[in-house]
């Protein structure tokens, strides 16, 4: 028998520095977690203790904190090289700055293979990107070889900016011939490493003949066997065992997100490359694990540029940006409009001639807007200003919801109106009219939404049975502020970009902003 240790991360999202337990900014260092310096300590400890170790990343290193905003992926290559990652799969967020924003900082600078079997380049890009990412890689591990085949969510064109010269194929269809190729090279131990979410990971384990282990990402899935060590609730045991169509037991793993855990899976293979046994658990990277001093020193050196960036002007406002709770929790506020407009602008993807855009709607809990910005400071808006407005380090995500769920959400928005509660919704691409004289649960008297399948966008009444795409904070997608109906009834949920980054990019693009209160949210009394 031959034993392999797979260490894995996924959806790190720019958490190079240690974070608080909820993966936001570290405040009390003695209780902070994760970060590349701490990760390196644990990885090195395992490498010294065990003979055959692979450190793998299942995508979405890009996007999530000011580190990515400033360094644009150079930080990912630098620190992944320093940690000696063995391979990485491309995630959807690796395309957030376009193909060039992937090629130059990461693909050309990584000292390890970067993989995806279901992304095919065409046209002029094909020769430019050739060899910079691979469908699979065979790696030497001890005296053996291990094949790693990559995959990426085929939804990436809707979630990021891969351009028109990359085709995202069906994962299973694309993986099978690559695995077959590995078999012809006499590679009999094969890991599928990718970024399509836990449901697809399980399908790959079931359907792709020859895959021995699946290491996934995208869905931030936490798996654990036994008593979990922190706040995350396990979606299943670690590893999650799938019985393949040809009768094999295939372990599937994922390690939550944000570098909080290091996935740790031990696999035993027989001489023919069959999995005999698999066991392990994610390792919580808490403060009991010291940060490696040399990596920490390097982090501190790179940090300097971030502090400078925070105070630079992104753009100007010529109006007061009213982010006060007195406004945003009671009525339409122009800070809410600005943020929602930025959220929609960040999700412009012309993927179909029938649609001017794939999404037109935004909702945003008023309680998530934490500060106004005064225009009487020369109009200057900085990252620091925006961090006061959006201090929670969230993301603006894409969900699919039925009209009936949206109606429930808007009823919830005003079910206890007048108490300055955070659930009052700010909107974009939506016109809502409330009648507060009616009883809670029946206060939405008009709900019109901006069409997407149209050349001239206009507002049409919401249809209860229709499925709509909506951009919203991850906080709402997860049922925060009492929006349980969103969490329970959403049909699809894809993580998006860092909230501050979305707004800062929009302001930089617009240069001068003047958002108004324009009648998106109205109140009426009387008959309708």
């Amino acid at each position: 028998a031959w034993e392999l240790t797979i260490l894995h991360t996924n959806d790190v999202h720019s958490r190079l520095e240690q974070t608080s337990e909820d993966s936001s900014k570290c405040v009390n260092a003695s209780r902070c977690m994760g970060g590349v310096a701490r990760l390196f300590t644990k990885v090195q400890q395992i490498r010294r203790a065990e003979p055959n170790v692979l450190l793998l990343d299942a995508g979405d290193q890009y996007q999530g904190t000011i580190w990515f905003t400033v360094y644009k992926g150079a930080e990912v290559a630098h620190f992944m090289n320093a940690l000696r990652y063995d391979a990485m799969a491309l995630g959807n967020h690796e395309f957030d700055n376009g193909v060039e924003g992937l090629i130059e900082p990461l693909l050309k600078e990584a000292k390890f293979p970067i993989l995806s079997a279901n992304i095919k380049a065409k046209g002029p890009l094909a020769s430019q990107i050739s060899g910079l990412y691979l469908p699979y890689k065979v790696l030497p591990v001890g005296d053996e070889v291990v094949g790693i085949v990559g995959y990426t969510s085929k939804e990436t064109p809707f979630l990021s900016n891969p351009g028109t010269n990359l085709v995202f194929e069906d994962e299973i269809t694309a993986l099978q011939p690559e695995v077959d190729k590995l078999k012809t090279l006499n590679v009999n131990k094969i890991i599928a490493l990718g970024h399509s979410g836990f449901e697809m990971d399980k399908l790959i384990a079931q359907k792709v003949r020859g895959v021995d282990v699946v290491v996934g990402g995208h869905s931030n899935t936490f798996l654990y066997t036994g008593n979990p060590p922190s706040k995350e609730v396990p979606a299943g045991k670690y590893p999650f065992i799938v019985t393949s169509d040809d009768g094999r037991k295939v372990p599937v793993v994922q390690a939550y997100a944000f570098g909080k855990y290091l996935g740790y899976l031990k696999i035993e293979f027989d001489e023919r490359g069959n999995v005999i046994s698999s066991h392990g658990n994610p390792i919580l990277l808490n403060s009991s694990i010291p940060e490696d001093p040399s990596i920490k020193a390097d982090i501190n050196k790179w940090r300097i540029k971030l502090d400078n960036y925070s105070t630079q002007e992104l753009g100007k406002t010529i109006v007061y940006l009213d982010g006060s709770s007195q406004s945003c929790r009671f009525r339409e506020c122009n800070m809410g409009n600005l943020i929602c407009d930025a959220m929609i602008n960040n999700n412009l993807r012309h993927t179909d001639e029938m649609f001017w855009n794939h999404v037109s709607m935004c909702i945003l809990n008023g309680g998530g807007i934490r500060s106004p910005i005064d225009e009487r400071n020369n109009g200057t808006i900085t990252w620091e200003n925006l961090a006061a407005v959006l201090p929670f380090g969230g993301t603006f995500d894409l969900v699919q919801l039925k009209g009936s769920t949206l109606k429930k959400a808007f009823e919830h928005s005003v079910h206890r109106y007048g108490q300055s509660t955070g659930e009052f919704l700010q909107v974009g691409g939506i016109h809502v009219v409330y009648d507060l004289s009616r009883k809670p649960g029946d206060r939405v008297v008009k709900l019109d939404v901006l069409c997407t399948k149209c050349r001239v966008p206009s507002y049409d009444p919401l249809k209860m049975d229709e499925v709509y795409k909506v951009i919203l904070p991850n906080f709402l997608a997860n049922g925060g502020d009492g929006f349980q109906m969103i969490k329970d009834e959403l049909l699809r949920h894809d993580s998006g970009d860092q909230d501050i980054n979305v707004v800062s990019t929009y302001i930089s693009k617009m240069k001068v902003i003047y958002p108004a209160v324009e009648g998106r949210i109205k109140f009426s009394t009387g008959s309708h």
Epitope: R84, D86, A110, K111, F112, P113, G131, L134, K137, V138, L139, P140, D143, V145, L185, N186, V187
Partner: nanobody, 124 residues
């Protein structure tokens, strides 16, 4: 465009020496491990030696240990194979190969790019 070009082959007497070079272009050599392989007429290609990108760690096939030395100069984008005490059974076409990874081995499946080869003939 990625290219590997071998040179330095030729005809040499048993006991003699040759220095093969592998010139890389189109990629930064310091990110790549380089391997030397050989294929004798009617035989399968076999791993001879390789050198890792990270710490210059080396591998040698048992048949060449103590006689062959691999080295690299990243600035010159070149890897050399110094072959001493050559034997008739060293006669083969010698290929260099590259992979983007820290470590290497004699398994040919791990390599991404291959040169066209240079002929080495050891004959008295």
């Amino acid at each position: 465009e990625v290219q590997l070009v071998e040179s330095g082959g030729g005809l040499v007497q048993p006991g003699g020496s040759l220095r093969l070079s592998c010139a890389a272009s189109g990629f930064p050599l310091d990110y790549y491990s380089i391997g030397w392989f050989r294929q004798a007429p009617g035989k399968e290609r076999e791993g001879v030696s390789c050198i890792g990108s990270s710490d210059g760690s080396t591998y040698y096939a048992d048949s060449v240990k103590g006689r062959f030395t691999i080295s690299r100069d990243n600035a010159e984008n070149t890897v050399w194979l110094q072959m001493n005490s050559l034997k008739p059974e060293d006669t083969a076409v010698y290929y260099c190969a590259a992979l983007k990874y820290y470590y290497c081995s004699g398994h040919e499946a791990i390599y991404d790019y291959w040169g066209q080869g240079t002929q080495v003939t050891v004959s008295g």
